[in-house]
């Protein structure tokens, strides 16, 4: 004969555990039913009566099978720098994430507690490491042969245009100005980060001689909430 299925509440066999979606009630010393997501225990089980469940009230939730006497409170409404990516329902908490142009400076289990605007690199500095959902932009000085003339949280240092004849030499915050009618721009992949080699045909001049190596990490600006550092703006 097949073993008889036990209905909750029931006393578990010594050494065995309760089944899925059941819990062991220490007071009743019985295996009792859990409540489904969106519900909570209104009446705990006894030796002869199973758990009585009730729906979570407005603005409260339970995400898992449970036997809690009270549902959890949904988080407060999302702030103006946030977007609600998941609404508060009886089965899930509200999730707030940062809106575009912002990153999460203080995260919580799900979503973000505190958003901060992404750092903007000022002219002469470009984005070394782009911002993510949870990290700020890192700025770095533009290396010789590259420039950035914008205040931006996305723009990287771009190579100076290569002139046949240079009218105004480029610097970290300004592109070179050519006198010839057809300037050429180097598209070498490494050119964004490294100074441009001078073409034997060009009269391109470097503003100041600097080592032609990529900047060391000491150029990178600190991450996290801090006063605007050199190369970044607070707005």
């Amino acid at each position: 004969l097949p073993a008889q299925v036990a209905f909750t509440p029931y006393a578990p066999e010594p050494g065995s555990t309760c089944r899925l979606r059941e819990y062991y009630d220490q007071t009743a010393q019985m295996c009792c039913s859990k409540c489904s997501p969106g519900q909570h225990a209104k009446v705990f089980c006894t030796k002869t009566s199973d758990t009585v469940c009730d729906s979570c009230e407005d603005s409260t939730y339970t995400q898992l099978w449970n036997w809690v006497p009270e549902c959890l409170s949904c988080g407060s409404r999302c702030s103006s720098d946030q977007v609600e990516t998941q609404a508060c329902t009886r089965e899930q908490n509200r999730i707030c994430t940062c809106r575009p142009g912002w990153y999460c400076a203080l995260s919580k289990q799900e979503g973000c507690r505190l958003c901060a605007p992404l750092r903007k690199c000022r002219p002469g500095f470009g984005v070394a490491r782009p911002g993510t959902e949870t990290s700020d932009v890192v700025c770095k000085p533009c290396a010789p042969g590259t420039f950035s003339n914008t205040t931006s949280s996305t723009d990287i240092c771009r190579p100076h245009q290569i002139c046949n004849v240079v009218a105004i030499p480029g610097n970290a915050s300004m592109d070179a100005v050519c006198t010839s009618t057809s300037p050429t721009r180097s598209m070498a992949p490494g050119a964004v980060h490294l100074p441009q080699p001078v073409s034997t045909r060009s009269q391109h001049t470097q503003p100041t001689p600097e080592p032609s190596t990529a900047p060391s990490t000491s150029f990178l600006l600190p991450m996290g909430p801090s006063p605007p550092a050199e190369g970044s703006t607070g707005d």
């Epitope: 007071t27 006894t46 009566s49």
Partner: antibody
Framework: QVTLKESGPGILQPSQTLSLTCSFS??????????VGWIRQPSGKGLEWLAH???????FYNPSLKSQLTISKDTSRNQVFLKLTSVVTADTATYYC???????????WGQGTTLTVSS | DVQMTQSPSSLSASLGGKVTITCKAS??????IAWYQHKPGKGPRLLIH???TLQPGIPSKFSGSGSGRDYSFSISNLEPEDIATYYC????????FGGGTKLEIT
């Protein structure tokens, strides 16, 4: 309005049996999740849970006094009874009855009845 | 059985001040703790259940917190009517009261 009131003999001699009654109003023991329990407080000491009974007649007793205690109810008369056999002087105390919620804490209490055990 | 160690057993505080009482359980009680105020000649009065939920009608000057085995209860802005003995009750595994804390106000 929930109210509970305890009544008892006041004075007993050692070895006698204590019989207490809790009469309540404002709720019914036929309602799912309702329970009534007994707690005592010896003079100058703390509170001690003794026993309680649920709407479905499930009963719980303090393990250290289980052999001496019996709890019962009369649902239609809104009463719960407690018997404690073979009393000793250490059972001198104020005895309280209290309502239990479905999630097992005591939310309403009576004012208590005093028992003195003396020869 | 679950034992509840309540401390201090007595304390004195000044009007308008704040006091904190702690209860330590001998095992995890899953936040199933209640706090009561008890005055002579009356039955205990429920203040807080499930660690931090205020009973309806109880002022927010009373608060509770904790998890696992360690729980605390605070009263702020002390008034003369707060003079009483306070008890914790664990109801996660049968029922056990703490030893009580007698509060005096100076």
């Amino acid at each position: 309005q929930v109210t509970l009131k305890e009544s008892g003999p006041g004075i007993l001699q050692p070895s006698q049996t204590l019989s207490l009654t809790c009469s309540f109003s404002g709720f019914s023991l036929s309602t799912s999740g309702m329970g009534v329990g007994w707690i005592r407080q010896p003079s100058g000491k703390g509170l001690e849970w003794l026993a309680h009974i649920w709407w479905d007649d499930d009963k719980f007793y303090n393990p250290s006094l289980k052999s001496q205690l019996t709890i019962s109810k009369d649902t239609s008369r809104n009463q719960v009874f407690l018997k404690l056999t073979s009393v000793v002087t250490a059972d001198t105390a104020t005895y309280y009855c209290a309502r239990l919620t479905g999630t097992r804490y005591f939310d309403y209490w009576g004012q208590g009845t005093t028992l003195t055990v003396s020869s | 059985d679950v034992q509840m160690t309540q401390s201090p057993s007595s304390l004195s505080a000044s009007l308008g001040g704040k006091v904190t009482i702690t209860c330590k359980a001998s095992q995890d009680i899953n936040k199933f703790i209640a706090w009561y105020q008890h005055k002579p000649g009356k039955g205990p009065r429920l203040l807080i259940h499930y660690t931090s939920t205020l009973q309806p009608g109880i002022p927010s000057k009373f608060s509770g917190s904790g998890s696992g085995r360690d729980y605390s209860f605070s009263i702020s802005n002390l008034e003369p009517e707060d003079i009483a003995t306070y008890y914790c009750l664990q109801y996660g595994n049968l029922w056990t009261f703490g030893g009580g804390t007698k509060l005096e106000i100076t």
